[in-house]
Amino acid sequence: GITSINCSGDMWVEPGEIFQMGMNVSIYCQEALKHCRPRNLYFYKNGFKEEFDITRINRTTARIWYKGFSEPHAYMHCTAECPGHFQETLICGKDISSGHPPDAPSNLTCVIYEYSGNMTCTWNTGKPTYIDTKYIVHVKSLETEEEQQYLASSYVKISTDSLQGSRKYLVWVQAVNSLGMENSQQLHVHLDDIVIPSASIISRAETTNDTVPKTIVYWKSKTMIEKVFCEMRYKTTTNQTWSVKEFDANFTYVQQSEFYLEPDSKYVFQVRCQETGKRNWQPWSSPFVHQTSQETGKRNWQPWSSPFVHQTSQTVSQVTAKSSHEPQKMEMLSATIFRGHPASGNHQDIG
């Protein structure tokens, strides 16, 4: 851009150097050259000479008009053709920008990742503005009425040390740029309700060599939260649909989850947890890939072919609808909750 140009005259922009994208724009060039009565005044945009919509207003001034200017940034300069000079003489230059006023920030969410020491707030910024847009995050204590403000570009991390005077806060985000200002809706936050447990990690998996092979997945977390509710989702690498199994977890020891899976198949596992009864989930853990062993018996059971009873304990029973079955013939199979649609939530989808 042109920030430190020595002008021999002036250049100005109507409606201004930063304007709303799609507006009609007039750029004026006024020369104040010594020993020159210019034959012509020329405009350049991004180094290219402009040919159209140029008007000579008087001896010293010319104007170029743009209909519906829609480039986010351009640098303009103008020159004079002075008699007796081989080269054009620079008069002045200006950076111009077009963009949009900000949308009201939406989907404001604040969480505290366990052990992070920060409250992290994120929001949707809306459509691109194309110009410098800042976000002011307001954090107001509902107990002391004190308000703190933080400048951000897309998210903010606020040290929990600065939130020690209170547990309940009102949070909102103000979007500001040269063309306007908008506020998000206010979010009520209780610090005890927004903690996300320390990351859950699948450490290993093994498939037993039984008649009906069983896969055991081992997973852990360093969380200090006592009551944790978790989901593990899994699928073959060739499948689009996840099955989800739910657990009440106690991380004082490594968790073990059992699955009866198709033999000789590559499975992807992911886990996520939340404090029981709270709203915010961890992101899904990194994908853990496990290859089940080849079939030894003749059984070929497909886990997505039968109805399941939904339970939130560590096992879910597969039962048949006919009551004539003798109890000893009822097979207990490990939990697969098939929800009939891909598992949703904040996750990185695999496959």
Epitope: I136, Q148, Q149, Y150, L151, S162
Partner: nanobody, 116 residues
């Protein structure tokens, strides 16, 4: 109660520099975002610049690249460094709590006059 005292204004030629100060008391300065606003003769209040408690800054387009806001938490003082001054920067300058807004809380202000 909250007290803000501006100083450092004066008469300066176009292209010159000044450093404004704002001494603050009566609140936890290190946790508080601050701003500068100004009022030119016969005009309304205009927001100039803001800074949050961590030192992130924001500027009005008219002063971007020429003015620098900063704060010294140890001294409970807010600063505004004014460089490459223009005649249109002539105004009464006020400091206030909060990053953004074209109001101030009734402090006395400091006068900046840019003239040749």
């Amino acid at each position: 109660q909250v007290q803000l005292q501006e100083s450092g204004g004066g008469l300066v030629q176009p292209g010159g520099s000044l450093r404004l100060s704002c001494a603050a008391s009566g609140f936890t300065f290190r946790l508080t975002a601050m701003r500068w606003v100004r009022q030119a003769p016969g005009k309304g209040l205009e927001w100039v610049s803001g800074i949050d408690s961590r030192g992130s800054t924001i500027y009005a387009d008219s002063v971007k690249g020429r003015f620098t806001i900063s704060k010294d938490n140890a001294k409970n003082t807010l600063y505004l460094q004014l460089n490459s001054l223009k005649t249109e920067d002539t105004a009464m300058y006020y400091c206030a709590q909060g990053v953004y807004g074209d109001t101030h809380s009734g402090s006395q202000g400091t006068q900046v006059t840019v003239s040749s």
